[in-house]
Interface confidence: low
């Protein structure tokens, strides 16, 4: 049957709707018009629009299709950056408090240490900083030059105070006598393991939010292919060359049509999900030693233990180590070791972690409810785009893409459709590049989160801890591995709390090598901007 | 083991353009920042160009900027300068080295060069 | 920029003998975080620069021990103990406190 003339025949509200879009009235002819040169808007009879008009339909389907990704992915998109960043903030604000019970621990009970062990720790803690955004620092050198740099200061000015400044050259003998003598016994192994595995879970953690991001700015930004544009012009707008301008089009043709512009981006779903999914697995595992609020808060405690256990062992070391760096030393000097009494100061402070509302776990468990409620995310979005644009409901008295019709069938529709365009093909192109790019990160990090999934993965622990725990060591189920317990005992006021005040600071934390320069807008740090004096500017 | 492999130098008159190429392999690149590093041929070092892991940060001497641009695809595992404008006193065999974070800017390993000469 | 200035620009030692090269900086290389970064390098004939010693005194892994690195503010020195044939080639010095990162003029090490 033809199809009903258009209701106006001089095009006048067409001309008077296109003029919103494109200013100026040449493109639009002013009576109907055969229309053989269209190729979107195919007519059946005399029609309004002309090839000038359908280009520029097809530009505008295409932002809208835009628009209303970007809008779709807009509460997703706030929900990831913005943990991104407060989680960011989260850790190197842990990282400064870490430092600061450290130098605090170091001030209180080994004055004579500082300000050198400030410098250690702030170097330490830098590199903390460094490894948790991205930096290929090995945790086990980190470790290693903490207490290579502590153990000559340790044994100048603690064990052996007597010696001159001419025997101070017996630096890099004391560096190397701490690894061979084990002077520290198995603390430095065991920090290394604690700090390993809580870093490397917290690193991966923020890489995946960064990820997150990532895949959301990558579909939000799609361009869309000219022939979906070409579909969905045909969807929108093809019934306003028929004068129809109060149509609107099939709910059923809307999601054919959308499932076929989006195509590409449906097939993130799987790794989407799964992405989700191993998120979840990786945050339920991060307490204990894969937490690293847990473990850097509790560091001061086992750094103060090994210097003490350093001074249980002084009057052995002391002459084994004077035997060993005479050469450097030219003479023997006479051990200053005292009882360890005297160093031990009881007020030693040690971390008690106090239940509170909002630590950095309940907000971890938190963002992954919310993410949880964007699993289908992908698979959903043609439907969502649909229900929040103009679509007939119950698909009765609608646009089809090429007449006015009573009830919308799907296979009518396609029949009629197939001289026109082809769906199958369009579904069959695959994905965009950037979106075959994306899904191999997502299958990358998902590799990553389910290596690193805790307590049952020991994984982790094959590529942190190859030569396994030493006697003394703590396994992974041992509470007392971190923080302490006994008559030193003092219950710290947490700082994490997200609503309280970020920028609480320790006393000490002005002491040399407290500086830390972190640019949270990225989600990687750069060597200048931590390499630059304060003084020189670097741009 | 550490490898870095530049390509891409090549004789070229002042004026033009040139880009160059490192291959890293060996160690996980998309983690490490990167730096461009030349030596004049009369032995003289100089750094040009240098590009944090992600990439967002490039910092550039002013004897190059504006004229010079590194990047790097961290999926290919590769570095890049790409050279404009070239002037006489950029001839120089040009080195991608990596730059420790934990050396703080030390540059632990470096490729064996790539030569660039610029002349009419 | 910082000015490297490395003496003497050409040292020549026999072997097993120790060698001394100086670098001076134009100001000085204590960042604001206490630490000092200065490098050592060395480039064999044909041979791209190998990093030997960061941060004044820390030996790069697989460096012997013979090499040793000291000094503070404006004025280091790297030590060679006992020279050995492999050690000879150009010395240089590098700075990364300071933005951008600068090389001294080097140093060749050469049979006397």
């Known amino acids: 049957q033809p199809p009903p003339p258009p209701p106006d025949a001089t095009c006048h509200q067409v001309r008077s709707f296109f003029q919103r879009l494109q200013p100026g009235l040449k493109w639009v002819p002013e009576t109907p018009v055969p229309g053989s040169d269209l190729q979107v808007c195919l007519p059946k009879g005399p029609t309004c629009c002309s090839r000038k008009m359908e280009e520029k339909y097809q530009l505008t389907a295409r932002l809208n299709m835009e628009q209303l990704l970007q809008s779709a992915s807009m509460e997703l998109k706030f929900l990831i950056i913005q943990n991104a960043a407060v989680f960011q903030e989260a850790f190197e604000i842990v990282v400064r408090h870490a430092k600061n019970y450290t130098n605090a621990m170091f001030k209180n009970n080994y004055p004579s240490l500082t300000p050198q062990a400030f410098e250690f720790v702030g170097e330490f803690f830098t590199d903390v900083s460094l490894y948790i955004l991205g930096s290929d620092i090995n945790v086990d050198d980190m470790v290693n030059e903490l207490f290579d740099s502590l153990f000559p200061v340790i044994y100048t000015q603690l064990m052996n105070p007597g010696l001159p400044d001419s025997a101070l050259d017996i630096n890099e003998c004391l560096r190397g006598a701490r690894r061979d003598l084990k002077v520290f016994g198995n603390f430095p192994k065991l920090i290394m393991t604690q700090v390993s595995k809580s870093l490397q879970v917290t690193r991966i953690f923020l890489q995946a939010l960064n990820l997150g991001i990532e895949v959301i700015n990558t579909t939000d930004h799609l361009k869309f292919s000219k022939d979906c544009g070409r579909m969905l012009t045909r969807m929108w707008y093809c019934s306003y060359c028929q004068g129809l301008m109060m149509v609107k089009p099939c709910g059923g043709y809307c999601n054919v049509v959308m499932q076929g512009c989006m195509a590409g981006v449906v097939e993130i779903d799987k790794y989407w999900r799964e992405y989700i999914l191993s998120l979840e697995e990786l945050v339920n595992g991060m307490y204990r030693i894969y937490d690293m609020e847990n473990v850097l808060l509790g560091l001061f405690s086992t750094i103060h233990d090994s210097i003490q256990y350093v001074q249980k062992n002084a009057g052995k070391l002391t002459t084994t180590i004077g035997k060993l760096c005479a050469h450097s030393q030219q003479r023997q000097y006479r051990s200053a070791y005292y009882p360890e009494d005297l160093f031990i100061d009881k007020k030693v402070l040690k971390v008690a972690h106090v239940e509170h509302e909002e630590t950095l776990s309940s907000r971890r468990r938190e963002l992954i409810q919310k993410l949880k409620s964007f699993i289908s995310f992908y698979s959903a979005l043609p439907g969502y785009i649909c229900s929040h644009s103009p679509v007939a409901e119950n698909d009765t008295l609608c646009w089809n893409g090429q007449e006015l019709v009573e009830r919308y069938s799907q296979k009518a529709a396609r029949n009629g459709m197939k001289n026109q365009f082809n769906l199958h093909e369009l579904k069959m192109k695959g994905p965009e590049p950037v979106v075959s790019q994306i899904i191999d990160k997502l299958k990358h990090i998902n590799q990553l989160l389910r290596t690193m999934s805790m307590p049952k993965g020991r994984v982790l622990d094959k590529n942190l801890d190859e030569e396994g725990f030493e006697s003394g060591d703590c396994g992974d189920d041992e509470d007392e591995c971190i923080g302490g317990s006994g008559d030193g005992m003092i219950k710290v006021k947490n700082q994490l709390r997200f609503l309280a005040e970020l920028a609480y600071d320790l006393d000490v934390d002005d002491a040399p090598g407290n500086s830390q320069q972190a640019t949270p807008k990225d989600n990687e740090i750069s060597t200048f901007h931590n390499l630059g004096n304060v003084h020189s500017p670097l741009k | 083991e550490v490898q870095l492999v530049e390509s891409g130098g090549d004789l070229v008159k002042p004026g033009g353009s040139l880009k160059l190429s490192c291959a890293a392999s060996g160690f996980a690149f998309g983690t490490y920042d990167m730096s461009w590093v030349r030596q004049t041929p009369e032995k003289r070092l100089e750094w040009v160009a240098y590009i944090s892991s992600g990439g967002n940060s490039p910092y550039y001497p002013q004897t190059v900027k504006g004229r010079f641009t590194i990047s790097r695809d961290n999926a290919k595992n590769t570095l890049y300068l790409q050279m404009s404008s070239l002037k006489s006193e950029d001839t120089a065999m040009y080195y991608c080295?990596?730059?420790?974070?934990?050396?703080?800017?030390?540059?632990?390993?470096w490729g064996q060069g790539a030569s660039v000469t610029v002349s009419s | 920029d910082v000015v490297l200035t490395q003496s003497p620009l050409s040292q020549p030692v026999s072997l097993g003998d120790q060698a001394s090269i100086s670098c001076t900086s134009s100001q000085s290389l204590l960042h604001s975080n206490g630490n000092t970064y200065l490098h050592w390098y060395l480039q064999k004939p044909g041979q791209s620069p190998k990093l030997l010693i960061y941060?004044?005194?820390n030996r790069f892994s697989g460096v012997p021990d013979r090499f040793s690195g000291s000094g503070s503010g404006t004025d280091f020195t790297l030590k060679i103990s006992r020279v050995e044939a492999e050690d000879l080639g150009v010395y240089f010095c590098s700075q990364s406190t300071h933005v951008p990162p600068t090389f001294g003029g080097g140093t060749k090490l050469e049979i006397k």
């Open positions: 080295a990596r730059q420790n974070i934990a050396r703080r800017g030390a540059m632990d390993f």
């Open positions: 941060k004044v005194s």
